[in-house]
C-alpha cells in the first residue's frame, strides 16, 4: 500500500522534521505551510487549520518561503549618484548601485548604501590601480620617462615620446617636445 500523504497541518513523527516549504509551529505543535515569496502569514496555523497567506503590500517584499506576519519594507529610493539595478517588487528588494564614475564607499547586504566619486589623478600622477564597484582609484607619481597631463580617474602614466632631437624635455606632467627638422 502506498504511504499516506500528510496534509498540513499535521503532527510530525517523533524525531522527524517538516517537509520542504513547511515549518514546525511550536504553539500548534504541527507542521504547517510556509507562504511563498511575495506573501506573508496573515493567519498562523492551528491544530486544524493551515497557515493563511496574503500578498505583500506595495513597497514591501518577501524573498523566501516564510511565515513572517509582515513583509519587509523595500529600501528607500536610489539617490542621485546611484542607478536602480533591481526594482522593488513583492518578491525582491530594490537594489541601488553606483553610477559610472562613482564607487561604493559603504555597502549593504545587496547594493550600495553610500556612493563616492572616483578619485581623479592630477597631472603628474597616473592611475596605479583602477577603481572598481567597491574600491577607489589609487594614483601614483609618474616615474621618470613617463607622464600624465590630465586630471583623470582612468588615465595611466604614458612614456614620453622619443625624439631624435629634444626641444623641451618631458617631465611627469608633460610629454617631451621634439625638434622638427626642416628639409
Amino acid at each position: 500500500l502506498p504511504a499516506q500523504v500528510a496534509f498540513t497541518p499535521y503532527a510530525p513523527e517523533p524525531g522527524s522534521t517538516c517537509r520542504l516549504r513547511e515549518y514546525y509551529d511550536q504553539t500548534a505543535q504541527m507542521c504547517c505551510s510556509k507562504c511563498s515569496p511575495g506573501q506573508h502569514a496573515k493567519v498562523f496555523c492551528t491544530k486544524t487549520s493551515d497557515t493563511v497567506c496574503d500578498s505583500c503590500e506595495d513597497s514591501t517584499y518577501t524573498q523566501l518561503w516564510n511565515w513572517v506576519p509582515e513583509c519587509l519594507s523595500c529600501g528607500s529610493r536610489c539617490s542621485s549618484d546611484q542607478v536602480e539595478t533591481q526594482a522593488c517588487t513583492r518578491e525582491q528588494n530594490r537594489i541601488c548601485t553606483c553610477r559610472p564614475g562613482w564607487y561604493c564607499a559603504l555597502s549593504k547586504q545587496e547594493g550600495c548604501r553610500l556612493c563616492a566619486p572616483l578619485r581623479k589623478c592630477r597631472p603628474g600622477f597616473g592611475v596605479a590601480r583602477p577603481g572598481t564597484e567597491t574600491s577607489d582609484v589609487v594614483c601614483k607619481p609618474c616615474a621618470p620617462g613617463t607622464f600624465s597631463n590630465t586630471t583623470s580617474s582612468t588615465d595611466i602614466c604614458r612614456p614620453h615620446q622619443i625624439c631624435n632631437v629634444v626641444a623641451i624635455p618631458g617631465n611627469a606632467s608633460m610629454d617631451a617636445v621634439c625638434t622638427s627638422t626642416s628639409p
Epitope: 504553539t27 500548534a28 498562523f44 486544524t48 487549520s49 493563511v52
Partner: antibody
Framework: QVTLKESGPTLVKPTQTLTLTCTFS??????????VGWIRQPPGKALEWLAH???????YYNPALKSRLTITKDTSKNQVVLTMTNMDPVDTATYYC???????????WGQGTTVTVSS | DIQMTQSPSSLSASVGDRVTITCKAS??????IAWYQHKPGKVPKLLIH???TLQPGVPSRFSGSGSGSDYTLTISSLQPEDVATYYC????????FGGGTKVEIK
C-alpha cells in the same frame, strides 16, 4: 467598534468552580483568524495568560493550569466561557478576556472582572 | 515554557527623559513580542506588536527593537501621561507576560 465584557461571580469559595463569560461585539468567532483568550492579574502582580480559543475551536491552555481550565465558545451568542475548577485564595485576581489576532497577539481587552476567593 | 524576564521592575524618570525597558526570553522567540501599557483602573493597551510595529494611534515616541531573545521598549521623551505599568508579551510559543515595569515621574 470591538468591545469585550467579562461577567461572573465576584466571590467564590475555595474548592468551588469559577465560571466566567466573555461577551463580545464588533467581530465574530466564525471569522477566519479570530480568537479570544483569558488573562488574569492577581493584586500587585503581573499579567498571566490562562487559555485561548480560535475560530476553528482549537484551544490552548497555560501548561501550569491546564488540568483546571476549560474554554468553550458559543459563536451564535458571541460568547466565550472559561471554567476554572478547585479555586484557591491564590486565584484571587482581575480576570480579563481579550481578542486575539490571526498572528497571535491580544489587540483589544475587556474591562476585567474582579474575583475574590475566600471562605 | 518560555520565561520572560523584564527589567527594571520599576523606574522613576523626569519628563523628557529617554526611558528603556527590556525583556529577555528564555529562548529565541523570533520577534514575536508585544508591548502593553496598563494604567491603574484602565484596560491594558496594545502599543507594539511583532517587536517594532506601532499600533495605530500610539505616539511615535514609543518604539520597539530586538531579535532572538532580547527585546527593548523605548520611550524617547517621557510624558506625564506615560505613567503606567508596561508589560511585554511573548507569543512565539504559547503566551507569556513579563513581570512588568512601573514607570513613574520624578
Amino acid at each position: 467598534q470591538v468591545t469585550l465584557k467579562e461577567s461572573g461571580p465576584t466571590l467564590v469559595k475555595p474548592t468551588q468552580t469559577l465560571t466566567l463569560t466573555c461577551t463580545f461585539s464588533g467581530f465574530s468567532l466564525s471569522t477566519l483568524g479570530m480568537g479570544v483568550g483569558w488573562i488574569r492579574q492577581p493584586p500587585g502582580k503581573a499579567l498571566e495568560w490562562l487559555a485561548h480559543i480560535w475560530w476553528d475551536a482549537d484551544k490552548y491552555y497555560n501548561p501550569a493550569l491546564k488540568s483546571r481550565l476549560t474554554i468553550t465558545k458559543d459563536t451564535s451568542k458571541n460568547q466565550v466561557v472559561l471554567t476554572m475548577t478547585n479555586m484557591d485564595p491564590v486565584d484571587t485576581a482581575t480576570y480579563y478576556c481579550a481578542r486575539m489576532t490571526g498572528t497571535r497577539y491580544f489587540d483589544v481587552w475587556g474591562q476585567g472582572t474582579t474575583v475574590t476567593v475566600s471562605s | 515554557d518560555i520565561q520572560m524576564t523584564q527589567s527594571p521592575s520599576s523606574l522613576s524618570a523626569s519628563v523628557g527623559d529617554r526611558v528603556t525597558i527590556t525583556c529577555k526570553a528564555s529562548q529565541n522567540i523570533n520577534k514575536f513580542i508585544a508591548w502593553y501599557q496598563h494604567k491603574p483602573g484602565k484596560v491594558p493597551k496594545l502599543l507594539i506588536h511583532y517587536t517594532s510595529t506601532l499600533q495605530p494611534g500610539v505616539p511615535s515616541r514609543f518604539s520597539g527593537s530586538g531579535s532572538g531573545s532580547d527585546y527593548t521598549l523605548t520611550i524617547s521623551s517621557l510624558q506625564p501621561e506615560d505613567v503606567a505599568t508596561y508589560y511585554c508579551l511573548q507569543y512565539g510559543v504559547l503566551w507569556t507576560f513579563g513581570g512588568g515595569t512601573k514607570v513613574e515621574i520624578k
